[in-house]
């Protein structure tokens, strides 16, 4: 909470000697626009209640953390809300003091009152000046419930507010009915917005036990302690006279806090400092109390008395919040009921006490389970304890279990017996199990069975090259998650272990088995380019490509060419072996079928970028074959071929090819093309003499059809010998494709 | 330096033509394959088509096929880009790039705009 | 064609702060998965091939991994240049497809 408290001098008899100071604690408070932020505010809050105009009231600052209102020139000018508020950004905090008139009708039993959430709250009005007429209750001045005045309980009106929620909180208001509001009774009702003992969004947390009266703050769990006290649990008694959480503040004048009211962040409030108490805080507590509002009870035992500032004062050889305690017995202190280590390791055990005669090292014992007394090596000592520090020899399962620090002095003993619990690091009993590799990566599943204790900390993966004298690579991994160990070189055999690790010192478990994996073949990285195909018949495709050079030696075995088939939905693949070939037949093809293609580079079993695709559309079976083949010699050295167009043709013909072949001779045929599809006759030239030939030929729509019928003639005689056989169409000659 | 450098962007009516070029220094141009990506305003990136690096082969994307003809001239460090037919969705910033032999479209011209509006 | 999916859309980070930007492929590329990055008004530039090496001139920061279907790009301590829209495309199969891009930008 911020270190923020709004002082109230309630020395009345002269309203212009009363002051409002607020004063604050944080660092750099009230220096206005400067780097510390914006200043302490204290003004009076008229949006309640109202009071006659009067002469401006003077604010003064006294150094950077203080500012006093004053020049109060009526009583009737105190009477109301007054707010102070300071600290920074979200610390930014409003301190609310309520004043009520000495003189009024009805005077508060209690001005402000801190509830929890669900609570039930009762405001008590007591009568003063006794006035015939109802009594209104109003919240933030707003009409809430009236009262017939006959209601007055033991002279008191009394407001009941069952289950209380935060927003209830605010000024409530207690007024004869035509009376002067500034003759109210006014109270501030502060609901904390948890039930008691929580804090936290959800009132979740549980809040720490604030002690001598200080309030759980409900947002941040932390006490706000009464005037007077500190620490984190208000467990400390301020001097008298002092306040503010670190009591660094001084009640102004000789008479100390007296007559001053302290107003502090919510959900504490105000009540007088502490040792004081009454409407006016001018009265000191009655014997056997003490704290702020002397709300506090002393019940010292053992000869010790009450101080109204501190509660109870303990004779020597006494402590405790009643001095309870002797100082003469020792005390063991805050020992843990358990403790957990892993075998073979050599913890150091601290054991600390307290008491009178003051323990010394060798007053403090530890013992084993077996008996075995060990002496601390090391004492601490502190003005309030005695810690021993004691060095465990390498433990072993046998010194699980019950363990006692025992500590010994003139004023007696005392002992404390806490759990041993040692446990066995981790250790893997399978090898690491392999999911996916790569050329340069694994992935590995490292979670295996263990013996041992757990739980697992961490997973250390350990790698290598197998066979290799080099240091181990290591990777911790979380244990629920696969691990990818990278940067490994293509195939690669590694050698692969895992540690396991427990919580704690020398919780390192022995590693577990090897085992190998290899890494994969590079990766194909090159492209190929598709840089040609011609169909060579109905069914055969002719395959070129191309890919890009790069400097070094080619990473693949070969390539694959994927022929697909979209309207069957099938996929034929071709494999080429040699990473060096650059074109394929492809044969056994669906005549008549469009195919998709595309080439990829392969390596061991991986695949490259396959190339873009091309589509091929593959002839049907090809054309029927010309009708009417007839062969006419013209010359010694020319015959002419005449025919008619076959039939029934599923396309425009492309070209004819014409096979000549010497009759009963041994040699390959001769293929003319008649490029001229339009033509029914050629003349094929450069015949020899006398000599008898066979024709035959066939159409060609992108693939070659049947062949026509044989035809055979003879050329005439006595010529020379030819250079060979060519065609002439009608319109020019045509070159030779054997 | 490497560089591609477009040209031949601009405001054009709905079933018009355009042709985009695509300058290519500073690199020896023909062992490369080339390719054309475009980006509509405030939208991703979008490949368009391809051709190899004798030029033998093209492939275009379903969204411009019959209408875009890609092709270069290896003689003058140029690639080409036809587009016919254009539609008010083929309205993008184009960007030619290059194909690096094993790091996919390591260089990118810096883009040219074609609006297609009426 | 091959789908990809690139998350989250935005990425609202400060300088200094770790990125990771994630692709997933509709079915496998192997590694063959590149990283680009575009600034407003420029053209995109490679940062990453081949899913996890560095482009020439690529600052350490930037490291890319994984294979398959999943891969991650990371940019380790996010420097003010940094803030930019980043696309991964795979190179596996034509037609090349890119994922639809991740902001990332300042918080």
């Known amino acids: 909470a911020v270190d923020l408290t709004l002082l109230a001098n309630l020395r009345l008899t002269d309203p212009q000697r009363f002051f409002l100071t607020c004063v604050s604690g944080e660092a750099g408070a009230g220096r206005g626009s400067d780097a510390w932020g914006p200043p302490l505010l204290l003004e009076k809050d008229d949006r309640i209640v109202r009071t006659p105009p009067g002469p401006p009231l003077r604010l003064a600052r006294n150094g950077s953390h203080q500012v006093t209102l004053r020049g109060f020139s009526k009583p009737s000018d105190l009477v109301g809300v007054f707010s102070c508020v300071g600290g920074a950004g979200a610390r930014r905090t409003r301190v609310i003091y309520v004043h009520n008139s000495p003189g009024a009708h009805l005077l508060p039993d209690k001005v402000t009152h801190t509830v929890n959430k669900g609570d039930t709250a009762v405001l008590s009005a007591r009568v003063h000046k006794e006035k015939q007429t109802d009594v209104i209750w109003k919240s933030n001045g707003s009409y809430f419930y009236t009262l017939d005045w006959h209601e007055a309980q033991d002279g008191r009106f009394l407001l009941q507010l069952p289950n209380v929620q935060p927003p209830s909180s605010g000024i409530y208001s207690a007024t004869y009915l035509e009376a002067s509001p500034l003759g109210s009774a006014f109270f501030r009702l502060i609901v904390r917005g948890c039930g008691a003992g929580r804090w936290g969004p959800g009132c979740t947390k549980e809040c720490p036990g604030c002690l001598h009266g200080g309030v759980c703050h409900d947002h941040d769990g932390e006490c706000v302690c009464p005037p007077g006290f500190t620490g984190t649990r208000c467990e400390q008694a301020c001097r008298e006279g002092r306040f503010g959480q670190s009591c660094q503040e001084q009640c102004p004048g000789i008479s100390g806090c007296r007559g001053l009211t302290f107003c502090l962040p919510d959900p504490y409030g105000c009540s007088c400092g502490s040792g004081w108490r009454g409407s006016q805080c001018q009265e000191a507590c009655a014997p056997g109390h003490f704290g702020a509002d002397c709300r506090l009870q002393c019940q010292c035992q053992n000869g010790g008395t009450c101080d109204r500032f501190s509660g109870c004062v303990c004779p020597s050889g006494w402590h405790g919040v009643h001095c309870e305690k002797s100082d003469r017995i020792p005390q063991i202190l805050n020992m843990a009921s358990e403790l957990e280590f892993n075998l073979e390791t050599m913890p150091r055990i601290n054991c600390a006490a307290a008491g009178n005669p003051f323990p010394v090292r060798g007053s403090i014992e530890l013992r084993k389970p077996d008996g075995t007394v060990l002496l601390s090596t090391k004492a601490i000592v502190e003005p309030e304890k005695t810690t021993a520090e004691f060095e465990v020899p390498r433990l072993v399962l046998a010194d699980s279990g019950f363990w006692e620090c025992r500590v010994s002095t003139s004023g007696g003993q005392d002992s404390r017996r806490f759990k041993v619990n040692v446990k066995v690091p981790p250790v893997p009993l399978a090898a690491p199990r392999l999911l996916t590799k790569q050329s340069r990566q694994l992935v590995v599943s490292p979670l295996v069975s263990f013996s041992g204790d757990g739980p697992i900390s961490t997973v250390r993966l350990h790698y290598r090259p197998q066979d290799s004298t080099m240091d181990w690579s290591t990777i911790v991994v979380d244990p629920s998650e696969n691990v990818t160990l990278m940067n490994l070189r293509p195939k690669t055999g590694y050698s692969v272990r895992v540690q396991l690790s427990r919580p704690g010192e020398g919780g390192e478990g022995a590693w577990g088995p090897p085992t190998l994996m290899t890494t994969d073949c590079p990766e194909p990285l090159l492209q190929p380019w598709l840089e040609g195909w011609h169909v060579e018949g109905t069914d055969r495709l002719r395959v070129s490509w191309s890919l890009p050079l790069v400097p070094g030696p080619l990473v693949g075995d070969g390539f694959l060419l994927r022929l697909w088939d979209g309207t069957r939905g099938q996929e034929r693949r071709e494999n080429v072996s040699s990473p060096q070939a650059r074109t394929a037949l492809l044969t056994g093809l669906t005549p008549g079928t469009h195919y998709q293609l595309d080439v990829q580079l392969y390596h061991c079993t991986l695949l490259g970028p396959a190339s873009p695709p091309a589509h091929v559309l593959l002839p049907p079976s090809g054309p029927p074959a010309p009708r009417h083949l007839h062969a006419q010699a013209l010359s010694d050295s020319e015959i002419q071929l005449t025919w008619k167009h076959p039939e029934a043709l599923p396309g425009p013909i492309s070209k004819y090819v014409v096979e000549v072949q010497v009759a009963g001779g041994a040699g390959d045929p001769l293929w003319i093309d008649v490029d001229r599809p339009e033509e029914t006759s050629t003349i094929i030239r450069g015949l020899n003499a006398s000599t008898r030939y066979l024709f035959r030929m066939r159409a060609s729509i992108q693939g070659l059809g049947d062949w026509s019928n044989t035809v055979e003639e003879s050329t005439l005689g006595n010529g020379l010998q030819a250079e060979g056989p060519v065609q002439e169409s009608r319109a020019a000659e045509e070159g030779l494709d054997q | 330096e490497v560089q591609l450098l477009e040209s031949g962007g601009g405001l054009v009516q709905p079933g018009g033509s355009l042709r985009l070029s695509c300058a290519a220094s500073?690199?020896?141009?023909?062992?490369?394959?080339m390719l054309w990506v475009r980006q509509a305003p405030g939208k991703g990136l979008e490949w368009v088509s391809v051709?190899?690096?004798?030029?033998?082969?093209?492939f275009y994307a379903d969204s411009v096929k019959g209408r875009f003809t890609i092709s270069r001239d290896n003689s003058k460090n140029t690639l080409y880009l036809q587009m016919n037919s254009l539609r008010a969705e083929d309205t993008a910033v184009y960007y030619c790039?290059?194909?690096?032999?094993?790091?996919?479209?390591?260089?990118w011209g810096q883009g040219t705009t074609v609006t297609v509006s009426s | 064609d091959i789908q990809m999916t690139q998350s989250p859309a935005t990425l609202s980070l400060s300088p200094g702060e770790r990125a990771t930007l994630s692709c997933r492929a509709s079915?496998?590329?192997?590694?063959?998965l590149a990283w680009y990055q575009q600034k407003p008004g420029q053209a995109p530039r490679l940062l990453i091939y081949?899913?996890?090496n560095r482009a020439t001139g690529i600052p350490a920061r930037f490291s890319g991994s994984g294979s398959g279907t999943d891969f991650t790009l990371t940019i380790s301590s996010l420097e003010p240049e940094d803030f930019a829209v980043y696309y991964c495309?795979?190179?596996?199969?034509?037609?090349?497809?890119f994922g639809g891009g991740t902001k990332v930008e300042i918080k």
């Open positions: 790039a290059r194909l690096g032999a094993e790091k996919g479209m390591d260089v």
């Open positions: 500073g690199f020896t141009f023909s062992p490369y394959g």
């Open positions: 051709i190899s690096p004798s030029g033998g082969q093209t």
């Open positions: 079915q496998s590329v192997s590694s063959y």
């Open positions: 081949d899913a996890s």
């Open positions: 495309q795979q190179r596996s199969n034509w037609p090349h497809t």
